[in-house]
Interface confidence: low
């Protein structure tokens, strides 16, 4: 449907609230170091002009793209040149490459200061003063550090930010009340950006048709209920949505994701019995509750899948007919029938079946060719199983802690080459899918953990990409989106690596270590601990770990000295020195 | 990652008309912004018409009322129809193709001659 005025169209649409934070988002996802201030100066703009094109859409440039309007407006940025350098080319190119320009240059590890929170009555006089100014403050900075969060629900956030400070600077304990729902809200972030940055890199690095596998494996086994031309449609809607997010098109996602929250809404008694509460919730709560639904129950009468996809002497005809809506059904009747598989089982089996018919179906007897294709998946099956069986054991025998210094030294030893804190931040993060999901029974402990991984790997390779530093690397995160996390399992000791110089400072600390939190502390920790095992890769888990109960009580004894400095610099040099003599350095 | 093929270009008199194709494969799932550019002997390339994915397009002033782009996304196919042809319009016409994902991709140009 054309509108004559795009900006007019979106903005009656939204709102003028949800506009300008759509556009606040947009523009502090695309130009990353630009200071609040300015950013708020273009809103209020682009809003001001959005105002003009409602009152007359025929008005002067109302009819631009929504990309020209905001790909002009970001670059009168006055100091484009010199803070982003060649992302300011991307003025001088005509709209159509423009955008893609831009696109490019979206950086996954800004160079941003962290985030520090300030002091709960400070936050609430801020909040107080200026509450709008508060929370656009808020969409900003979360924006600007994660460019690929998905907007509409970075709004829901920020709805439930809004509401944290409104109850709690109000309660007698503001600290108590606010402190852990800050903490709940930047857990949650995190987990939600990365798995956004996962749609986006399947769309962007996989295409259209890996992410519509992913869509339709997981919508059918939340609901296992609807016919597969109701989830079909919702798999083509979810595609557009994520595509216009994942491009930049932040306003035309998040009216299209509400267009696609009524549709089910209105349709959930073919859909899914889980949808009731969901569906009586405000926008932004009722599409989050959608996205987060439990699975409805499988229905109870389901036949064997052998009889369509084995048995049947039609497979290699309904296959060459229509090759992907037979493959879609496939992975749509493997997948409701399975909410204790993961979804990137379900796709390694789907894949494995679609190998399987191109084959066969070329051959003399195709039916007898295929008839042992089941089989085929009982060792794609057992491998994830077994492996989180034996990961979870090491979980529970450990704790979280410990588990995270077994990761960091596995991952380490498979890619010495990838830097240190991002090998800190990917296997501290490998190490949570054991409390995250070990506490489940066996039916969902895969799709739990094995997606979660998925998530957690693309973070991997996403830093990766950006500076390259190892082959394996780029091989598993590039040749298979579905098989990347058995191509990091499967990887062993890197054997070509040349172990790295030792440097002492590396291992010099000090007593600013004793006033860190304590998870600043553990990172402190396992940090040396990767240093250590590129000094000395072939390290065994007794002498790291010897190394490392030496480093904790150095530390312990060092903050309780009345002269912290000086210890951490006497004592600090004799745990160097007994170090490298356990290590052989 | 997007190919573009154009087609259809000749020689026409001035006055008359003539129907530009260009047939897009590859991921053509990712594309956006479609559009035609023409490049003039000694001149530079520039932009003709563009059409976005919601089919919003735009013109160059001097093919406004002449020119008319369209898309056929189930064809993955561009059109250029030209109407009113002048000897000015002689040029090598090119697709382009803004994409999502990939760097923007360009036809390899068909010639148009305008000429009695």
């Known amino acids: 449907d054309a509108h004559k005025s795009e900006v007019a169209h979106r903005f009656k649409d939204l709102g003028e609230e949800n506009f300008k934070a759509l556009v606040l988002i947009a523009f502090a996802q695309y130009l990353q170091q630009c200071p609040f201030e300015d950013h708020v100066k273009l809103v209020n703009e682009v809003t001001e002009f959005a105002k003009t094109c409602v009152a007359d859409e025929s008005a002067e440039n109302c009819d631009k793209s929504l990309h020209t309007l905001f790909g002009d407006k970001l670059c009168t940025v006055a100091t484009l040149r010199e803070t982003y350098g060649e992302m300011a080319d991307c003025c001088a190119k005509q709209e159509p490459e423009r955008n893609e320009c831009f696109l490019q240059h979206k950086d996954d590890n800004p160079n941003l200061p962290r985030l520090v929170r300030p002091e709960v009555d400070v936050m609430c006089t801020a909040f107080h003063d200026n509450e709008e100014t508060f929370l656009k403050k808020y969409l900003y900075e979360i924006a600007r550090r994660h460019p690929y969060f998905y907007a509409p629900e970075l709004l829901f956030f920020a709805k439930r930010y809004k509401a944290a400070f409104t109850e709690c600077c109000q309660a007698a304990d503001k600290a108590a009340c606010l402190l852990p729902k800050l903490d709940e809200l930047r857990d949650e972030g995190k987990a939600s950006s990365a798995k956004q940055r996962l749609k986006c890199a399947s769309l962007q690095k996989f295409g259209e048709r890996a992410f519509k596998a992913w869509a339709v494996a997981r919508l059918s086994q939340r609901f296992p209920k609807a016919e597969f031309a109701e989830v079909s449609k919702l798999v083509t809607d979810l595609t557009k949505v994520h595509t216009e997010c994942c491009h930049g098109d932040l306003l035309e996602c998040a009216d299209d994701r509400a267009d696609l929250a009524k549709y089910i809404c209105e349709n959930q008694d073919s859909i899914s019995s889980k949808l009731k509460e969901c569906c009586e919730k405000p926008l932004l709560e009722k599409s989050h509750c959608i996205a987060e639904v439990e699975n409805d129950e499988m229905p109870a009468d389901l036949p064997s899948l052998a009889a369509d996809f084995v048995e049947s002497k039609d497979v290699c005809k309904n296959y060459a007919e229509a090759k992907d809506v037979f493959l879609g059904m496939f992975l749509y009747e493997y997948a409701r029938r399975h909410p204790d598989y993961s979804v990137v089982l379900l796709l390694r089996l789907a894949k494995t079946y679609e190998t399987t018919l191109e084959k066969c179906c070329a051959a003399a007897d195709p039916h007898e060719c295929y008839a042992k294709v089941f089989d085929e998946f009982k060792p794609l099956v057992e491998e994830p199983q077994n492996l989180i069986k034996q990961n979870c054991e090491l979980f529970e025998q450990l704790g979280e802690y410990k588990f995270q210094n077994a990761l960091l030294v596995r991952y380490t030893k498979k890619v010495p080459q990838v830097s240190t804190p991002t090998l800190v931040e990917v296997s501290r993060n490998l190490g949570k899918v054991g409390s995250k999901c070990c506490k489940h029974p066996e039916a969902k402990r895969m799709p739990c953990a094995e997606d979660y991984l998925s998530v957690v790997l693309n973070q991997l390779c996403v830093l990766h990409e950006k500076t390259p530093v190892s082959d394996r690397v780029t091989k598993c995160c590039t040749e298979s989106l579905v098989n990347r996390r058995p191509c990091f399992s499967a990887l062993e000791v890197d054997e070509t690596y040349v172990p790295k110089e030792f440097n002492a400072e590396t291992f010099t600390f000090h007593a600013d270590i004793c006033t860190l939190s304590e998870k600043e502390r553990q990172i402190k920790k396992q940090t040396a601990l990767v240093e250590l095992v590129k000094h000395k890769p072939k390290a065994t888990k007794e002498q790291l770990k010897a190394v490392m109960d030496d480093f904790a009580a150095f530390v312990e004894k060092c903050c309780k000295a009345d002269d912290k400095e000086t210890c951490f610099a006497e004592e600090g040099k004799k745990l160097v020195a007994a170090s490298q003599a356990a290590l052989g350095l | 990652e997007v190919q573009l093929v154009e087609s259809g270009g000749g020689l026409v008199q001035p006055g008359g008309s003539l129907r530009l194709s260009c047939a897009a494969s590859?991921?053509?799932?990712?594309?956006?912004?479609l559009a035609w550019y023409r490049q003039a002997p000694g001149k530079q390339r520039d932009l003709v018409a563009r059409?976005?994915?919601?089919?919003?397009?735009y013109y160059a002033d001097s093919v406004k009322g002449r020119f008319t782009i369209s898309r056929d996304n189930s064809k993955n196919t561009l059109y250029l129809q030209m109407n009113s042809l002048r000897a000015e319009d002689t040029a090598v016409y090119y697709c382009?193709?803004?994409?999502?994902?990939?760097?923007?991709?360009w036809g390899q140009g068909t010639l148009v001659t305008v000429s009695s």
């Open positions: 382009y193709a803004q994409s999502t994902w990939y760097p923007p991709s």
């Open positions: 059409i976005s994915s919601g089919g919003s397009t």
């Open positions: 590859g991921s053509t799932w990712s594309i956006n912004t």
